[in-house]
């Protein structure tokens, strides 16, 4: 798997998952955010050969096709699999909030 | 939507759904398909600015980065979203085979 | 029941050359078609690497094996073969088949690896 585990221990040139830390108020210009200061949201990148952790038939058709005619501008892109949530606190005039917000960390990647 | 309907008729350089017709024979060499000669698989490109049909929070946060941060080289990628079937014809020895290809046709794409 | 058998692997000196051979055995590969055909090498740490692929009537090779390898296929027998030429330290690696079948959609199956080694 495309994951956090291999990708992170490895040189790996092709589609992987990469660390990518964003301070809330340096990155983003977020200062309602009051924990945590940043996080790691990490991304997807590296080209897609063929059989790379293809998603659906079209993927592997397009590596295939990409392979075999290296000319070509198409070819799959490597993007999040699996991510997970982020629990935040900030605050609503003094009244402190917790929320957990879905999709924020990337956790692995695919071939789409 | 970034849909066939849409994308076919405009010249947008964002993220779209671009047409790619296949040659089953000259582009995969393919000689078992027998039916039909080839078809459009499409594909999906273009660059992905911040909320352009942003796929999940983390798309959105890491379009936003990207925008605030330009030297940044991490950013969504425009992918598929919608993806119909392809039927086709083969034969096994003399006996013909129909067969349905799921997820073969892409219809419109996403930032992801 | 469906296999993919390996063989031709071991030994060599820099220079030197192997051949290698895999069969698909097993009534899938009768009864549905085969669209590709593929040799994958991988070395520790690494993901498999596509060496060379081979359709019908098209091919292609990695870079770095280009003019050394050629990829071969006996459809009769559903066998495929990489010849391998001067062949250099750097292509030590478990050399993996790969048949990809049409059923229910693009289907991939992995042979168990055959170790090649170059070395003097």
């Known amino acids: 798997a495309l994951d956090t585990n291999y990708c992170f221990r490895n040189l790996e040139e092709n589609c992987c998952v990469r660390p990518l830390y964003i301070d809330f108020r340096q990155d983003l210009g977020w200062k309602w955010v009051h924990e945590p200061k940043g996080y790691y949201a990490n991304f997807c990148s590296g080209p897609c050969p063929y059989l790379r952790s293809a998603d659906t038939t079209h993927s592997t058709v397009l590596g295939l096709y990409n392979t075999l005619n290296p000319e070509a501008s198409a070819s799959p892109c490597c993007v999040p699999q699996d991510l997970e949530p982020l629990t935040i606190l900030y605050y609503v005039g003094r009244t402190p909030k917790v929320e957990q917000l879905s999709n924020m960390v990337v956790k692995s990647c695919k071939c789409s | 939507a970034l849909d066939t309907n849409y994308c076919f008729r405009n010249l947008e350089e964002n993220c779209c759904v671009r047409p790619l017709y296949i040659d089953f024979r000259q582009d995969l060499g393919w000689k078992w398909v027998h039916e039909p000669k080839g078809y459009y698989a499409n594909f999906c490109s273009g660059p992905c600015p911040y909320l352009r049909s942003a796929d999940t929070t983390h798309s959105t946060v890491l379009g936003l980065y990207n925008t605030l941060n330009p030297e940044a080289s991490a950013s969504p990628c425009c992918v598929p979203q919608d993806l119909e079937p392809l039927t086709i014809l083969y034969y096994v020895g003399r006996t013909p085979k129909v067969e349905q290809l799921s997820n073969m046709v892409v219809k419109s794409c996403k930032c992801s | 029941q469906l296999q993919l058998v390996e063989s031709g692997g071991g030994l060599v000196q820099p220079g030197g050359s192997l051949r290698l051979s895999c069969t698909a055995s097993g009534s899938t590969f009768e009864i549905y078609p085969i669209y590709a055909m593929a040799w994958f090498r991988q070395t520790p740490g690494k993901q498999r690497e596509l060496v060379a692929l081979?359709?019908?009537?098209?091919?292609n090779y990695a870079d770095s094996v280009k003019g050394r390898f050629t990829i071969s296929r006996d459809n009769a027998k559903n066998t495929v073969y990489l010849q391998m030429n001067m062949l250099q330290p750097e292509d030590t690696a478990v050399y993996v088949c790969?048949?990809?079948?049409?059923?229910?959609?693009?289907?991939?199956?992995w042979g168990q690896g055959t170790q090649v080694t170059v070395s003097s």
């Open positions: 081979t359709t019908d009537v098209k091919t």
């Open positions: 790969n048949v990809g079948v049409v059923r229910g959609g693009l289907q991939n199956y």
